[in-house]
């Protein structure tokens, strides 16, 4: 999905208000000096498909995210505010029920989750100019 | 507990340099940006630039392009501002800050650095 | 640049009374706006980042509100220790810019 055409103000707002307190919910216990970011951004689109594909594709000892109620928030905002998104998602979602695992915290995600809110840092204050 | 400390202060000639070092602690230094304000004596605060540690990446204030240079050492976690052509303009407190946890606002500052040119 | 134009510039305030300060941008800055306080002989400090969620810690006693160009920042009752120089500041563009400040005295 090109995420060019998305109202990114309003994703900003939806984060704000919400996503981001659940960011930290999920985080909370871990030392600020534990994760160092690795994956980065560089402009609104682009931060945007890096945040997609951390919160909802399973990875190699974080399969979980995407129910998270964070990740459920992001999708909302997204098919809200993204034209064309949440069709996009459909055939996605259909694979993701047949592998849907228990919840479970483990120490990669919440280097993946940390890895998110560097992303959503950069996706709020893009350091380009013309951003 | 998140510290910025900066460097002491500093008296300079005019034309010549300062380089002002603000050392940062209790956080994973690379994932926040540091950014640098000054104020000169009785005025308000004025941004010079940021710096995104990680990468390097910096912006900076038109006003100050050419003769502010903003550095990081992660290696140390410090961040370094340096102001060349110095005038008497430029006398002011210098400070670092990281920006909050969201990307919005700046949450912590270093305590300041008096830098004063004079001849 | 963003001009961010702080009135007023000064404000006295009997304790427990309520203080308001205005800050108007030159253009619209959606609700990228944050409020600082700068107490005394001390650094800046977070209050309000965009526009009304408060930092952590910070009473809510103190409130932001406004979008695009108009913005308020409240004092619902002052307190001596609210004595200092508030800022409001915009990120919405390069280069980030500040109000000139508005100092709060306590009568």
């Known amino acids: 999905y090109d995420f060019t055409n998305c109202d990114f103000e309003k994703i900003k707002a939806a984060y704000l208000s919400t996503i981001s307190k659940d960011l930290i919910t999920y985080m909370s216990g871990t030392k600020s000096t534990e994760f160092n970011n690795t994956v980065s951004c560089s402009n609104r689109p682009h931060c945007l498909t890096e945040i997609q594909s951390l919160t909802f594709n399973p990875t190699a000892g974080c399969a979980s995210l995407a129910k998270e109620m964070f990740a459920m928030k992001t999708k909302a905002a997204l098919a809200i505010w993204c034209p064309g998104y949440s069709e996009t998602q459909i055939n996605a979602t259909q694979a993701m029920k047949k592998r849907r695992k228990r919840k479970v915290t483990t120490n990669k995600c919440l280097e993946q989750v940390s890895q998110l809110q560097g992303l959503w840092r950069r996706f709020n204050r893009p350091l380009l100019k013309q951003q | 507990e998140v510290q910025l400390v900066q460097s002491g202060a500093e008296v300079k000639k005019p034309g010549s340099s300062v380089k002002v070092s603000c050392k940062a602690s209790?956080?994973?230094?690379?994932?926040?940006?540091i950014e640098w304000v000054r104020q000169a004596p009785g005025q308000g605060l004025e941004w010079i630039g940021v710096?995104?540690?990680?990468?390097?990446?910096?912006n900076y204030n038109e006003n100050f392009k050419g003769r502010a240079t903003l550095t990081a050492d992660k290696s140390t976690s410090t961040a370094y501002m340096e102001l060349s052509s110095l005038r008497s303009e430029d006398t002011a407190v210098y400070y670092c800050?990281?920006?909050?946890?969201?990307?919005?606002?700046?949450?912590?500052w270093g305590q300041g650095t008096t830098v004063t040119v004079s001849s | 640049s963003i001009v961010m134009t702080q009135t007023p510039l000064s404000l006295s305030v009997t304790p427990g009374q309520p203080a308001s300060i205005s800050c108007k941008a030159s253009?619209?800055?959606?609700?990228?706006v944050t409020w600082y306080l700068q107490k005394p002989g001390q650094s800046p400090q977070l209050l309000i980042y965009?526009?009304?969620n408060h930092y952590t810690g910070v009473p809510d006693r103190f409130s932001g509100s406004g979008s695009g160009t108009d913005f308020t920042f409240k004092i619902s009752r002052v307190e001596a220790e609210d004595v200092g120089v508030y800022y409001c500041?915009?990120?919405?563009?390069?280069?980030?810019?500040f109000g000139q400040g508005t100092k709060l005295e306590i009568k």
């Open positions: 965009y526009v009304s």
């Open positions: 500041q915009q990120h919405h563009r390069f280069p980030l810019t």
């Open positions: 710096i995104d540690p990680g990468n390097g990446d910096t």
């Open positions: 253009q619209s800055v959606s609700s990228d």
């Open positions: 800050a990281r920006e909050d946890n969201t990307g919005t606002a700046f949450d912590y």
């Open positions: 209790g956080y994973a230094f690379s994932n926040y940006l």
